[in-house]
């Protein structure tokens, strides 16, 4: 039975040109995390494999940085980065857990600064 839950940063906003940290945390399970995938609208951004480390998709190499931890840092944000992001935790023996984050990239300094993991 899958008992775990994923906590995420939820809905966050950031300024165009800035950076943001996408962060998820899996709790309430003793399952072993074998890999975390970060996706945006069915596009794979990055993989963090428990044994092998990080793989960043070539098309995102210039703007995506691994970490902190199992999180992902998006840099040089554009308005086109607005949308849903998913952290997909592959675990053993539980299976797959998915968390959702909605990022809004704003044109000016109207970005809210309430996000817990946001880089100022």
């Amino acid at each position: 039975m899958m008992t775990g839950t994923i906590e995420t940063t939820g809905n966050i906003s950031a300024e165009k040109g800035g950076s943001i940290i996408l962060q998820c945390h899996l709790s309430s399970t003793t399952a072993q995390v074998t890999q975390v995938n970060w996706e945006q609208q069915d596009q794979l951004l990055a993989i963090c494999n428990a044994d092998l480390g990080w793989h960043i998709s070539p098309s995102f190499k210039d703007r995506v940085a691994p970490g902190p931890g199992l999180g992902l840092t998006l840099q040089s944000l554009t308005v086109n980065d607005t949308g849903e992001y998913f952290c997909i935790y592959h675990t053993y023996p539980d299976g797959t857990y998915t968390g959702r984050i909605f990022l809004e990239v704003l044109e000016s300094s109207v970005a809210e600064h309430g996000a817990r993991f946001q880089i100022p």
């Epitope: 995938n37 092998l52 480390g53």
Partner: antibody
Framework: QVQLVQSGAEVKKPGASVKVSCKAS????????MGWVRQAPGQGLEWMGI????????SYARKFQGRVTMTRDTSTSTVYMELSSLRSEDTAVYYC???????????????WGQGTTVTVSS | DIQMTQSPSSLSASVGDRVTITCRAS??????LNWYQQKPGKAPKLLIY???SLQSGVPSRFSGSGSGTDFTLTISSLQPEDFATYYC?????????FGGGTKVEIK
Amino acid sequence: QVQLVQSGAEVKKPGASVKVSCKASGYTFGSYYMGWVRQAPGQGLEWMGIIDPSGGRTSYARKFQGRVTMTRDTSTSTVYMELSSLRSEDTAVYYCARARTPSSWPYGMDVWGQGTTVTVSS
Amino acid sequence: DIQMTQSPSSLSASVGDRVTITCRASQSINSYLNWYQQKPGKAPKLLIYAASSLQSGVPSRFSGSGSGTDFTLTISSLQPEDFATYYCQQSLLTPFTFGGGTKVEIK
């Protein structure tokens, strides 16, 4: 040219261990992950695990965990695959294969060794 | 582990035929799908990586398509040297599992 040369055929008794070597040449050894794949007679391909030759990190298929050890010797550009507690079902051709892309693993294996036949028989 | 299912397991075709082999993953693997060709007594050879990218030196009659869970390898005009066994492999999530193989035989 890029080449992987494996050690010769082995005949082992059940319960024994075997260590297969794979010597790389023609490229920067530490920059490419190396995988191991086996093929039992008349059967398909079975992925066993992968090693990062620069840092020595490994990932093993759960089926082989506890029985397989992959290591590397950077001074000789050689990776090793040791399989212990051999049984008859381990009779197979064992291949080493290099990941296609430097410092990454998800894009297939483009260079393969010639294969090492391991026979387990009492 | 992700299961990879290939179909058909074998097929008979003639030189010049268009041949299609399919591979289905038990869960989404994005585009992390590779195709290999293996001839008897030989090591596998990489044909296609990342679902649709042709490996250097591989003839253009080979092509790959698909994403998510459903993938296809197509040989547009089968040549005598193409009679072999073909395997798909997912490389998204360890263990990087293979399909059961498709043997392409001469009709």
